[in-house]
Amino acid sequence: LPAQVAFTPYAPEPGGTCRLREYYDQTAQMCCSKCPPGQHAKVFCTKTSDTVCDSCEDSTYTQLWNWVPECLSCGSRCSSDQVETQACTREQNRICTCRPGWYCALSKQEGCRLCAQLRKCRPGFGVARPGTETSDVVCKPCAPGTFSNTTSSTDICRPHQICHVVAIPGNASMDAVCTSTSPTRSMAPGAVHLPQPVSTRSQHTQPTPAPSTAPGTSFLLPVGPSPPAEGSTGD
């Protein structure tokens, strides 16, 4: 004979457990139904009546099958440095993540509690490690033969242009200036070491391959310095 299907509420076998989506009510000493996501227990079960569920009110939610008396409050609205990547519904909490150009300096279980602006590398420094959702940009000085004349959270150090005749040698924050003959910007795809530029002052000693220049990158001609807006911060 097939086993008899028990309808909630029911008393479990001695030492037995309740089924999936059921819970054991200590007061009634019965297995009772849980409420589905988006609902909560309005009335707890008794020996003769099952749990009565009700929908969560606005700005509250339950994400799991549950028997909580009240739904959980959704988190506060996202701050100005954040974007709402998941709205508050009856079944899920609001999730705030940092907007582009920012990273999460203090995370919480879901989303971010505190965002901070990504560091911008000043002239003479390039991005050695880009920012991620949870880590800041790392800026490092441009290696000999490379430069950065921008203030940026994305720009790497770029090779000095190679001149047939140098008018002004380049340094870490300025490209070399050539006399009227057309310059070249030599960077072979897949190159590991930076080419040593012609007639440029060594800015500093660098025993390892330049950390802040990505090999195989296609380089544009230099742009003018672009300092950040007055009063803006890099951290």
Epitope: R122, P123, P207, E230, G234
Partner: antibody, heavy 119, light 106 residues
Framework: EVQLQQSGPEVGRPGSSVKISCKAS????????MHWVKQSPGQGLEWIGW????????DYAEKFKKKATLTADTSSNTAYIQLSSLTSEDTATYFC????????????WGQGVMVTVSS | DIQMTQSPPSLSASLGDKVTITCQAS??????IAWYQQKPGKAPRLLIR???TLESGTPSRFSGSGSGRDYSFSISNVESEDIASYYC????????FGAGTKLEIK
Amino acid sequence: EVQLQQSGPEVGRPGSSVKISCKASGYTFTDYIMHWVKQSPGQGLEWIGWVDPEYGSTDYAEKFKKKATLTADTSSNTAYIQLSSLTSEDTATYFCARDDGSYSPFDYWGQGVMVTVSS
Amino acid sequence: DIQMTQSPPSLSASLGDKVTITCQASQNINKYIAWYQQKPGKAPRLLIRYTSTLESGTPSRFSGSGSGRDYSFSISNVESEDIASYYCLQYVNLLTFGAGTKLEIK
């Protein structure tokens, strides 16, 4: 909390060398370069140079290129400056200070080390 | 290398006065100037970065301004705790300090 803890005062003989240290804590040592600054008694601040602890690369002010050697040890999160061929001109307080390569150079400083050159 | 000419070398003010220190760079430094306060026997302390951005903990009576080659630093309402030496620093190309200004109270 970010801290730069420098070693104790040094006395060196003329012609000898001294090496002083700056131990960093409270941040990722390899993410920042470390500068050294000299201050002679009653005088202003002079930039000596920097070391990048991650790569060992350095740069120096022209006047200190033959005088100072900057190094760093990532296993102990410590930066060092060695001053060679000491003369009375090297009697000064030496500070370390970190730099994130952004808008805030020298946001944290060591307390300084007094180096006295005396025979 | 960029030179920084700071003036005046010393300054005597009464409590409540406004004082101004200037730094002139030998070339355009694109606002990459910081200002430091140093008290006797102590390490310098960063007050202002990138010309005018007050560091956390810097009182609002301190301010900075300027562009190109010319920059200034002011204390609007001098207090006794402001007695110290003040230095500018350019950090756009290597680093160079100004010679410093010693602030005294009359």
